[in-house]
C-alpha cells in the first residue's frame, strides 16, 4: 500500500493531495507544490517537503521559519529545485538569479554566486549531529534507557534502521544523536538520515508531518522528555567550499 486506502490519505506526509486515481483505482498521493507522486509507506524527501511548505498560502501557513538557533542551516527556508526522484538539485537559484551549491539535505555549502556557478555533483551529507536540550527534570535520565528509546523512536516513527544511529550521547540536559550513513551503506529502500532528521526536527517543534499519527510523545521509563531547543549540524562526504571572507 502506498497510501491508506479507506480514506485515501498519506500517513507519512500531510502535505499531499490524494485521490483514488492510481492503477486499479488505488489511492495515489502527490506532494503539494511539485505534484510529484510520493510513496506513503516511507518518509517523503526533505526537498519535496520544503517545496510543499513554500507553496502553502502565507496566511494558512501554521509552520514557522527556523529560529535564531539554526546555526548551520542559517539561510532559512527557500523554494528548492528537486530532481525527479525528489532529491535536491546540486545547484539552487532564487528568483534574482543568485545561485549556490547545496548538499543532500539542501544546506548551502558554497558562497553565493550568479548563474555561471557550477555545482558538479550533489555532495552527500553522511553524518548528522542532532543536539538537543531537554527541559529540567527531577533527575537525569538513565543513559541506556534514553539510548534505547531514541533508537526505537527513529526505527518505529521514521523507519530509520538502528545501524544508522551511530551514537546517543547524554550530559544532562544535553542529548546528542549521531546519525551516520555513507553512500555505500544506504541500500535501496533505506530511509535517508537527512529525511529522518528533518521529520524529527519538525516533530520536536510540534509541527509533525505525519497524517493521523499523534504528535511526538517521547518518554523514557514513563518520564516525558520535552525538548527545549534543537541544533542540527551537517557533515558532508566532501568538505564545503566557502571563501575566507565568510569565515571572518
Amino acid at each position: 500500500h502506498t497510501a491508506a486506502q479507506d480514506n485515501c490519505t498519506c500517513p507519512t506526509n500531510k502535505m499531499t493531495v490524494c485521490s483514488p486515481d492510481g492503477p486499479g483505482g488505488r489511492c495515489q498521493c502527490r506532494a503539494l507544490g511539485s505534484g510529484v507522486a510520493v510513496d506513503c509507506s516511507t518518509l517523503t524527501s526533505k526537498c519535496l517537503l520544503l517545496k510543499a511548505r513554500m507553496s502553502a498560502p502565507k496566511n494558512a501557513r501554521t509552520l514557522v521559519r527556523p529560529n535564531e538557533h539554526a546555526l548551520v542551516d542559517n539561510d532559512g527556508l527557500y523554494d528548492p529545485d528537486c530532481d525527479p526522484e525528489g532529491r535536491f538539485k546540486a545547484r539552487q537559484c532564487n528568483q534574482t538569479s543568485v545561485c549556490w551549491c547545496v548538499n543532500s539535505v539542501g544546506v548551502r555549502r558554497t558562497d553565493k554566486g550568479d548563474l555561471s556557478l557550477r555545482c558538479d555533483e550533489l555532495v552527500r551529507t553522511h553524518h548528522i549531529l542532532i543536539d538537543l536540550r531537554h527541559r529540567p527534570t527531577a533527575s537525569a535520565f538513565n543513559h541506556s534507557d534514553l539510548d534505547a528509546e531514541l533508537r526505537r523512536l527513529f526505527r518505529e516513527r521514521y523507519r530509520l534502521h538502528p545501524k544508522f544511529v551511530a551514537a546517543v550521547h547524554y550530559e544532562q540536559p544535553t542529548i546528542q544523536i549521531e546519525l551516520r550513513q555513507n553512500t555505500s551503506q544506504k541500500a535501496a529502500g533505506d530511509v535517508d538520515i537527512g529525511d529522518a532528521a528533518y521529520y524529527f526536527e519538525r516533530d520536536v517543534k510540534g509541527e509533525s508531518l505525519f497524517q493521523g499519527r499523534g504528535g511526538l510523545d517521547l518518554r523514557v521509563r514513563g518520564e516525558p522528555l520535552q525538548v527545549e531547543r534543537t541544533l542540527i549540524y551537517y557533515l558532508d562526504e566532501i568538505p564545503p567550499k566557502f571563501s575566507m571572507k565568510r569565515l571572518t
Epitope: 500500500h1 509507506s41 534505547a148 528509546e149 526505537r152 534502521h161 545501524k163
Partner: antibody, heavy 120, light 110 residues
C-alpha cells in the same frame, strides 16, 4: 545455514531462577534484533523481550515487571534470558526469534524452543 | 498499547477450499502486520509480512490483505499440510506492548 538453538530449560521449583541461552550460527548476530517468545502448553504465543545486540538496547513486554532480563554476549553470538521468581504460570516452551533485519518487527528465524517446567 | 484480536478461534476447511482468518488491531498499525503458521511441536514460521508480502519459500496459496486496523489471511486451494494454528502479529512497535501476537486461529482440514 542460519540457525538458532535454545538451551537451559528444565524443571525448576516455584520461586526459583533459571537462565536460558540461545546460540546463533550462520549469521552475524550484530545485524539483527532478537526476541524471546514463550508458549504455555496448549496456549498462544506471548512476547517477552527484545534486544538489539549491537547497542545492548533492551525492551520488555509490560507484564514482565523486572522479573526477566534479556542480555547478549555478542562475541559468542549468544542471547540469554534470566528468569526470576518463577511461578507455575511461567511453565512454557521458550523460543528465541530473530527479526528480518529491517525496521519492522517480524521474526523470520526461530529456534526449536526449550521447555521450562515450574513445579514443586 | 496495541491489542491484536483474531477470529475465528477455530475453523474447518475442506481440501481444495478457501479459508479466511481475520485479525483486528486496537489502533492503526498501517501495514505493519505479520502472519505465522505453527504446527504442533514446531516453532512458528513466518508466512507474510507487511500485511501482504509473502515470506521467502512460502506458497502463493497464502495471501494477506488489509491496512490500518483490519487484516485478513486467506488460504486458497487448502491442502492437508495447511492444518495448523495461525497467528497475526503487529510488527509496528515494541514500546508499551503487552503482547504483539493475536490469540491464534486453528485451521482443521477435513
Amino acid at each position: 545455514q542460519e540457525q538458532l538453538k535454545e538451551s537451559g530449560g528444565g524443571l525448576v521449583q516455584p520461586g526459583g531462577s533459571l537462565t536460558l541461552s540461545c546460540k546463533a550460527s550462520g549469521f552475524d548476530f550484530n545485524n539483527y534484533g532478537v526476541s524471546w517468545v514463550r508458549q504455555a502448553p496448549g496456549k498462544g504465543l506471548e512476547w517477552i523481550a527484545y534486544i538489539y545486540p549491537t547497542y545492548h538496547n533492551t525492551y520488555y513486554a509490560t507484564w514482565v515487571n523486572g522479573r526477566f532480563t534479556i542480555s547478549s554476549h555478542n562475541a559468542q553470538n549468544t542471547l540469554y534470558l534470566q528468569l526470576n521468581t518463577l511461578t507455575a504460570a511461567d511453565t512454557a516452551t521458550y523460543f528465541c526469534a530473530r527479526d528480518a533485519g529491517g525496521t519492522d518487527y517480524n521474526f523470520n528465524l526461530w529456534g526449536p524452543g526449550t521447555l521450562v517446567t515450574v513445579s514443586s | 498499547d496495541v491489542v491484536m484480536t483474531q477470529t475465528p478461534a477455530s475453523v474447518e476447511a475442506a481440501v481444495g477450499g478457501t479459508v479466511t482468518i481475520n485479525c483486528q488491531a486496537s489502533q492503526s498499525i498501517e501495514s505493519y502486520l505479520a502472519w505465522y503458521q505453527q504446527k504442533p511441536g514446531q516453532p512458528p514460521k513466518l508466512l507474510i509480512y507487511e500485511a501482504s508480502k509473502l515470506a521467502s519459500g512460502v506458497s502463493s496459496r497464502f495471501s494477506g490483505g488489509g491496512y490500518g486496523t483490519e487484516f485478513t489471511l486467506t488460504i486458497s486451494g487448502v491442502e492437508c499440510a495447511d492444518a495448523a494454528t495461525y497467528y497475526c502479529q503487529q510488527a509496528l512497535t515494541i514500546g508499551n506492548v503487552d503482547n504483539p501476537f493475536g490469540g491464534g486461529s486453528e485451521v482443521v482440514v477435513k
